[in-house]
């Protein structure tokens, strides 16, 4: 190797200056005694290199790029060799930003997968490889005192969520949770959440069903629907409130909300609807009165209201 580049920093803030030095060894005898060292950033030649001969006979060129405005580029030093440019050495330069503070960190406890799933917004693009780590610890109190640390949760590349498995969780006990973002230019941390995994539980919705008509029960009135629901069994012991939404299948009507309904109602007569009309219905539930997240809306149930009972009109004929 005849030449070697060293840089003040290979990774800098976007727009910051960068200084580089290229040294050519004396024993490169096939070179001119006073070779002119050229600089190139990407495909563009860069003026402004200051060249000097050092006491040991090596040649050095120093260049300062006032603003590195490329997020990634190769800086090379070269010599004119005949009619072509002979590259002596090159380095990769990167420029970007330190990570912004991750924000909107939120978590939900999934009782089916037995894991606490946390997600966040990473903030603006840094243009640099940036790693995110979900960090947490167990705490007996309100997270002012740190208990056992929990194994870091590292999301897959490009993902802004991570799942803490059950073996690292303690239900009905607070956990401190935060996201740490790190790249070559710095580290940032989100504000810490302090939560009991059960307080962010997201239940599965009940299954809506048509109510089986029983011989002794009166049929639904016109504009009414009789429906029932089957609670999600594993969440049965969690006190919940639920809400229904419905809309006619035809037309552009928006959803109408009915609730709150206690989970234990298990059956319901919905009235005030249009007669002889097909409706789409869904239900969802939330842990209540304790904190929790709304479940997703259940799969739709499609039901039709009964016809209006025929009314007898007396027609008066006027002669």
């Amino acid at each position: 190797e005849c030449g070697h580049i060293s840089v003040s920093a290979p990774i800098v803030h976007l727009g910051d200056p960068i200084t580089a030095s290229c040294i050519i060894k004396q024993n490169c005898s096939h070179l001119d005694p006073e070779p002119q060292i050229l600089w190139r950033l990407g495909a563009e030649l860069q003026p402004g290199g200051r060249q000097q001969r050092l006491s040991d006979g090596t040649q050095e060129s120093i260049i300062t790029l006032p603003h590195l405005n490329h997020t990634q580029a190769f800086l090379s030093c070269a010599l004119n060799w005949g009619n072509s440019l002979q590259i002596l050495d090159q380095v990769e330069l990167r420029a970007g930003y330190p990570p912004a503070i991750p924000h909107n960190l939120s978590c939900l406890m999934n009782l089916t997968t037995s894991s606490l799933i946390c997600q966040w917004e990473p903030g603006p693009e840094t243009h640099l490889p940036t790693s995110f780590t979900l960090k947490s610890f167990k705490s007996r109190g309100n997270c002012q005192t740190q208990g056992d640390s929990i194994l870091d949760c590292v999301p897959k590349d490009g993902q802004s969520h991570c799942s803490i498995p059950r073996k690292h969780l303690l239900l009905y006990q607070n956990m401190g949770i935060w996201v740490q973002a790190e790249n070559a230019l710095g580290t940032s941390m989100s504000p810490q959440l302090c939560l009991d995994p059960m307080d962010v539980v997201k239940l599965e919705p009940p299954m809506l069903r048509t109510m089986d008509p029983s011989p002794e029960a009166a049929p639904p009135q016109a504009g009414c629907l009789q429906l029932s629901w089957e609670p999600w069994q594993p969440g049965l012991h969690i006190n919940q409130k639920c809400e229904l939404r419905h809309k006619p299948q035809r037309g552009e009507a928006s959803w109408a909300l009915v609730g709150p309904l206690p989970l234990e109602a298990l059956q319901y007569e919905l009235c005030g609807l249009l007669p002889a009309t097909a409706y789409t219905l869904q239900i969802r539930c939330i842990r209540w009165p304790l904190p929790g997240h709304w479940s997703d809306w259940s799969p739709s149930l499609e039901l039709r209201t009964t016809e209006r009972a025929p009314t007898h009109h007396h027609h008066h004929h006027h002669h």
């Epitope: 997968t113 037995s114 059960m198 594993p234 234990e264």
Partner: antibody
Framework: EVQLLESGGGLVQPGGSLRLSCAAS????????MGWVRQAPGKGLEWVSS????????PYADSVKGRFTISRDNSKNTLYLQMNSLRAEDTAVYYC???????????WGQGTLVTVSS | DIQMTQSPSSLSASVGDRVTITCRAS??????LNWYQQKPGKAPKLLIY???NLQNGVPSRFSGSGSGTDFTLTISSLQPEDFATYYC?????????FGGGTKVEIK
């Protein structure tokens, strides 16, 4: 401190009836599912029945369905088990229990013995 | 109905031993598996809920693991007060079922 105190056990003839009570204190009774678990002499634990916080959901073990009725009075903080058509195989210590949100039996009473014998 | 099979039905061990009891569900129950300890003439006591969560006041030598169908209760170093009968219970769906019990006796 949570306390569950069962009463109403005793000796009863086959075909007879008995009503067990469980007086609860030390927690907000109306917010929790409650249940009954029994244990025949020298045998393991057997779930009998549970009741939701407001009493609307009442699952039963097949072995007692149609004969036993679980109920609660939230104003009195009391759980009940009405046992009819009793059989010799219903002989057991009956425990009243408070359920946690994930269905575990969190707190237990000391138990009351029901003996069905002629 | 979900059946719970516990093994062994009894075991003999010495103070300081590591003891493992297993419980198998006839179908997947996620993490809805609870463990209880019962001493003669006493009511059962909750040790572990939701497969691995230690109930308040229970010594840390007790631990639970597993999910789906296979679960384990481990006592890392058996103490004199641990000689008792242990039961597992599924709370995933009704009817709730207990395992047959494991009696831990002094060797």
């Amino acid at each position: 401190e949570v306390q569950l105190l069962e009463s109403g056990g005793g000796l009863v003839q086959p075909g007879g009836s008995l009503r067990l009570s469980c007086a609860a204190s030390g927690f907000t009774f109306s917010l929790y599912w409650m249940g009954w678990v029994r244990q025949a002499p020298g045998k393991g634990l057997e779930w009998v029945s549970s009741i939701s916080s407001s009493g609307g959901v009442t699952p039963y073990a097949d072995s007692v369905k149609g004969r036993f009725t679980i109920s609660r009075d939230n104003s009195k903080n009391t759980l009940y088990l009405q046992m009819n058509s009793l059989r010799a195989e219903d002989t057991a210590v009956y425990y009243c229990a408070k359920l946690g949100e994930l269905g575990f039996f969190q707190e237990w009473g000391q138990g009351t013995l029901v003996t069905v014998s002629s | 109905d979900i059946q719970m099979t516990q093994s062994p039905s009894s075991l003999s061990a010495s103070v300081g031993d590591r003891v493992t009891i297993t419980c198998r569900a006839s179908q997947g129950i996620s993490s809805y598996l609870n463990w209880y300890q019962q001493k003669p003439g006493k009511a059962p006591k909750l040790l572990i809920y939701y497969a691995s969560n230690l109930q308040n006041g229970v010594p840390s030598r007790f631990s639970g693991s597993g999910s789906g169908t296979d679960f384990t209760l481990t006592i890392s170093s058996l103490q004199p007060e641990d000689f008792a009968t242990y039961y597992c219970q599924q709370s995933y769906a009704y009817p709730q079922q207990f395992g047959g019990g494991t009696k831990v006796e002094i060797k």
